[in-house]
Amino acid sequence: ELCDDDPPEIPHATFKAMAYKEGTMLNCECKRGFRRIKSGSLYMLCTGNSSHSSWDNQCQCTSSATRNTTKQVTPQPEEQKERKTTEMQSPMQPVDQASLPGHCREPPPWENEATERIYHFVVGQMVYYQCVQGYRALHRGPAESVCKMTHGKTRWTQPQLICTGEMETSQFPGEEKPQASPEGRPESETSCLVTTTDFQIQTEMAATMETSIFTTEYQ
């Protein structure tokens, strides 16, 4: 089941999935001046079986000036430099597929890809938040959000993160010790069935991950 909305927006913070549940879709978007090739897919889809997950379809962009062709366009040097910058900002593959069954890793960039990625998440997806550079994390609880099914509708849990304007970069998942607070999980979900999966394994995985998993471009 696809989630109705994007994850919640937190002021001065970005979110990132460490792995993508099967069923997740990623739009094939191209940078300005380029378009998806005519025979190409509109999306990539995370699919798989019990032992292996991967992205179906490949995104391909071509120059807008050459409609109806499948020719791949070699980026100019300045475009190659721009893409390299993006890759350096996101140096790690978020998760080894073998460590999290039923999930795909971050797809590698494709040539002339747009600088923003739009994912269509599915129920059970977890994303993690980090304050942007120049802001410091204050935690009241987990800096994460999960797409849940409640009463037949999907919704994202509210991450318990505040980013303050102190000129100090926070480390993921935050150098502040989370406060023991009754509002750490504000939603009361005992009254009906909630569909959740893989939360425990993802949380455990998150604790072992590197800190530099965010880019401001792929929000």
């Epitope: 994007d6 509109l42 739009i118």
Partner: nanobody, 123 residues
């Protein structure tokens, strides 16, 4: 509550152009793909075109050379520019919004529909 309201339909002569609009309200449509279908009496709804938030498009081969979809995110509005209209383009045109592009081609999977706008092409 999500609402999709189409406008711009009407009667035109063969060879003329028409631009349909679909104004969306009731939620954020950032992670939705939006597009157009049409239906003639007694037939199934036919997929025409879809567009993502960032402007990626997918068109049915039958209309790709004559119809162009576009999107104004600031107005939450999607457009369908229809050129060189033919009598066989006569139909009710529906705006649609769906959470995922994979399911979009099948009308049975679409999450939200507009009420439709009639387009008639005849001399």
């Amino acid at each position: 509550q999500v609402q999709l309201v189409e406008s711009g339909g009407g009667w035109v002569q063969p060879g003329d152009s028409l631009r349909l609009s679909c104004a969306a309200s009731g939620r954020s449509f950032r992670n939705y793909v939006m597009g157009w279908f049409r239906q003639v009496p007694g037939k199934e709804r036919e997929f025409l075109s879809v567009i993502t938030w960032l402007g990626g498009t997918l068109d049915a081969d039958s209309v790709a050379d004559r119809f162009t979809i576009s999107r104004d995110n600031s107005k939450n509005t999607v457009y369908l520019q229809m050129d060189s209209l033919k009598p066989e383009d006569t139909a009710v045109y529906y705006c649609a919004a769906d959470r995922g592009p994979a399911r979009y081609i099948s009308a049975s999977d679409v999450d939200y529909w507009g009420q439709g706008t009639q387009v008639t092409v005849s001399s």
